[in-house]
C-alpha cells in the first residue's frame, strides 16, 4: 500500500502507422500537489511527451479534462503514429517542492511497439495425390506480422493436429516476420471431403483468428475396386456382363473391355454415380454375343484410373448348353 | 490498522535540542509520508514539516533553521529534531500520516522550562 | 505564506440546525483543478480527526452531515443538522504552497 499509486495497466501496446495511440494513467490520489508528466524513456535523458501545465505538443490531447476537479486520468492521445514513437512511456507524479517540482512516482511504463496484422495464412498441399494410408504434408504461410510471437494451430475436420513443425523468421530483431508450418496428415479413405485448416492467432487480430483451408480433396486419390459379374437372364442370343468400379476418387477413369485378350471398340452401356463420402462408383455393362461362342471366352474389364496403372478384373464366361441350344433355336 | 505513536522527553531546557520520535504501524514508511504538527496549549495547530516515502524533506521555512526530519525505515520510526528550544515552543507534537494527514498519534507534551 | 482566516471564532447553534464555518485563504489554493483545501474536527484532549479533502470530498466514516464546498480562496464548511457530539474545534488546512498552514480555528458550542 501506498500514499499515492501510478496505475498504467497495459505493459504492451501495439499501434499501427498513421493511427492514434492510446496511453493510459490514472492515479489513486490527488495528493500531494503536484503535476503528471509523460515522458518515453528513463533517465537524463528521457523526453517529455506531455506537461499539462506547460509546453507545446501538437500530437498530444488528454483522454479526460485535467482541469476538473478530482480527476484521477491523466491518459492521453498520440496521434499519427510513426515508427519513432516506439519506446517506454512512463506517466509522472511531480510534487510541489520548493523551489522546484520534485519527481514524486513513477508509473511502471507502457512499451509503445509497430502492431503489424499477419497475412491470410495460404495452405498448400502436396504436388501429387496420395492413396489413403499414407501421411501427405501441408504447408501453412503467413506473412507481415509484428511483433514476432505468434501462434499457429491445425486442424483436420475440427480435430486439432499435433503432427507439425513451425518455424518464425528471422530469428533476431525486426520490423516484421514470417510464419512457416508443414503438418503431416495420414489421409483416411474418407477424406474427400475432409479439410485442412491453419489457424494463425496475433495479438493485432484481437482474439479473432485468421484461417486457410485446404480441401483433401486435392490430395488424396481412392483407387477403385473392380467387380465384373455376368448377369443371370440373357436378352436374346446375348449375355450381359457387368464390370462395378467403387469407391474411387479423383472422376478421371478410363473403362475398356477385352474379348479374350482383343480390345472391344463397340461402346458400352454405363453410369456414374457419387457416394455420401464423396468417392464415385462407375458401372458398365458389355453384351456378349454367345450364338457362336465356345466355351472358353474370358472377358476382362480394365480401368485406368487418374493416370495411374490400369488394373482389370477378368470373368470367364459361362454359356451353358442349354444356354446354347437356346440361342440356336433363336438364330435359325 | 494503521497507528502512529509518539514519544518524546516532555521536559527540555530552553536553548536545549527536542528529540521526538514517531513509531508507525499499519503502513510502510517506504510508501507513505510523516507530517510533524505542533499545537501550543490551547491555541491553534502549526505544520512543521513532512518527510516523504522516498526520505525527501520539506520544512516550514520559519522553523527550518532549526529543524530535522528522519527516519529510519525499517523500525518503522520517523525523528523530529529540534534545536533551539525556547517557551513558545513548549506544545503538543503530534505526528501525522501523508499529505492527506489522515491518521494521527496522540501527540506528546512538551514543556520548554529551566 | 498562505494565511487561512476562520469565521467566526465560535457559534453557538441549538441542536438540529445547521452550522456554517468559512475559510478565506490569502491566495488561491487551486492547483490542476482541485483545491488543496482540508477541514479536521479537534476535541479537547483529542488529536485533530479529519473530515473533509481537497474542499468536498467526506473522509471515510464520517456522516453526511458534514459538507465541504468553495473553490481558490473561499471555502465553507457546513454541518446540518449538528448533534451534541459535533461540540469540537474545527480547523481548516492548506497543502498547496510551502509551508503548509492551518486556520485558527472556529469553536462550535451547541446550544
Known amino acids: 500500500e501506498e500514499e499515492l499509486q501510478m496505475i498504467q495497466p497495459e505493459k504492451l501496446l501495439l499501434v499501427t502507422v498513421g493511427k492514434t495511440a492510446t496511453l493510459h494513467c490514472t492515479v489513486t490520489s490527488l495528493l500531494p500537489v503536484g503535476p503528471v508528466l509523460w515522458f518515453r524513456g528513463v533517465g537524463p535523458g528521457r523526453e517529455l511527451i506531455y506537461n499539462q501545465k506547460e509546453g507545446h505538443f501538437p500530437r498530444v490531447t488528454t483522454v479526460s479534462d485535467l482541469t476538473k476537479r478530482n480527476n484521477m486520468d491523466f491518459s492521453i492521445r498520440i496521434s499519427s503514429i510513426t515508427p519513432a514513437d516506439v519506446g517506454t512511456y512512463y506517466c509522472v507524479k511531480f510534487r510541489k517542492g520548493s523551489p522546484e517540482n520534485v519527481e514524486f512516482k513513477s508509473g511502471p511504463g507502457t512499451e509503445m511497439a509497430l502492431g503489424a496484422k499477419p497475412s491470410a495464412p495460404v495452405v498448400l498441399g502436396p504436388a501429387a495425390r496420395t492413396t489413403p494410408e499414407h501421411t501427405v504434408s501441408f504447408t501453412c504461410e503467413s506473412h507481415g506480422f509484428s511483433p514476432r510471437d505468434i501462434t499457429l494451430k491445425w486442424f483436420k475436420n475440427g480435430n486439432e493436429l499435433s503432427d507439425f513443425q513451425t518455424n518464425v523468421d528471422p530469428t533476431g530483431q525486426s520490423v516484421a516476420y514470417s510464419i512457416r508450418s508443414t503438418a503431416r496428415v495420414v489421409l483416411d479413405p474418407w477424406d474427400v471431403r475432409s479439410q485442412v485448416i491453419c489457424e494463425v492467432a496475433h495479438v493485432t487480430l484481437q482474439g479473432d483468428p485468421l484461417r486457410g483451408t485446404a480441401n483433401l480433396s486435392e490430395a488424396i486419390r481412392v483407387p477403385p475396386t473392380l467387380e465384373v459379374t455376368q448377369q443371370p437372364m440373357r436378352v436374346g442370343n446375348q449375355v450381359n456382363v457387368t464390370c462395378q468400379v467403387r469407391k474411387f476418387y479423383p472422376q478421371s477413369l478410363q473403362l475398356t473391355w477385352s474379348e479374350n485378350g482383343n480390345v472391344c471398340q463397340r461402346e458400352t452401356a454405363s453410369t456414374l454415380t457419387e457416394n455420401k463420402d464423396g468417392t464415385y462408383n462407375w458401372t458398365s455393362w458389355f453384351l456378349v454375343n454367345i450364338s457362336d461362342q465356345r466355351d472358353d471366352v474370358v472377358l476382362t474389364c480394365q480401368v485406368k484410373h487418374d493416370g495411374q496403372l490400369a488394373v482389370s478384373k477378368r470373368l470367364a464366361l459361362e454359356v451353358t448348353v442349354h444356354q446354347k441350344d437356346q440361342s440356336s433355336d433363336a438364330t435359325p | 490498522e494503521v497507528q502512529l505513536e509518539e514519544s518524546g522527553p516532555g521536559l527540555v531546557a530552553p536553548s536545549q535540542s527536542l528529540s521526538i520520535t514517531c513509531t508507525v504501524s499499519g503502513f510502510s514508511l517506504t510508501g507513505y509520508g510523516v507530517n510533524w504538527v505542533r499545537q501550543p496549549p490551547g491555541k491553534g495547530l502549526e505544520w512543521l514539516g513532512i518527510i516523504w516515502g522516498d526520505g525527501s524533506t520539506d520544512y516550514n521555512s520559519a522553523l527550518k533553521s532549526r529543524l530535522s526530519i528522519s527516519k529510519d525505515n525499517s523500525k518503522s520510526q520517523v525523528f523530529l529534531k529540534m534545536n533551539s528550544l525556547q517557551s513558545d515552543d513548549t506544545a503538543r507534537y503530534y505526528c501525522?500520516?501523508?499529505?492527506?494527514?489522515?491518521?494521527w498519534g496522540q501527540g506528546t507534551s512538551v514543556t520548554v522550562s529551566s | 505564506d498562505i494565511v487561512l482566516t476562520q469565521s467566526p471564532a465560535s457559534l453557538a447553534v441549538s441542536l438540529g440546525q445547521g452550522a456554517t464555518i468559512s475559510c478565506r485563504a490569502s491566495?488561491?489554493?487551486?492547483?490542476?483543478?482541485?483545491?488543496?483545501m482540508h477541514w479536521y474536527q479537534q476535541k479537547p484532549g483529542q488529536p485533530p480527526k479529519p473530515l473533509i479533502y481537497?474542499?468536498?470530498n467526506l473522509e471515510s466514516g464520517v456522516p453526511a452531515r458534514f459538507s465541504g464546498s468553495g473553490s481558490r480562496t473561499d471555502f465553507t464548511l457546513t454541518i446540518d443538522p449538528v448533534e451534541a457530539d459535533d461540540a469540537a474545534t474545527y480547523y481548516c488546512?492548506?497543502?498547496?504552497?510551502?509551508?503548509?498552514?492551518f486556520g485558527g480555528g472556529t469553536k462550535l458550542e451547541i446550544k
Open positions: 491566495e488561491s489554493v487551486d492547483s490542476y483543478g482541485n483545491s488543496f
Open positions: 481537497l474542499a468536498s
Open positions: 488546512q492548506q497543502n498547496n504552497e510551502y509551508p503548509w498552514t
Open positions: 501525522a500520516r501523508a499529505g492527506k494527514m489522515d491518521y
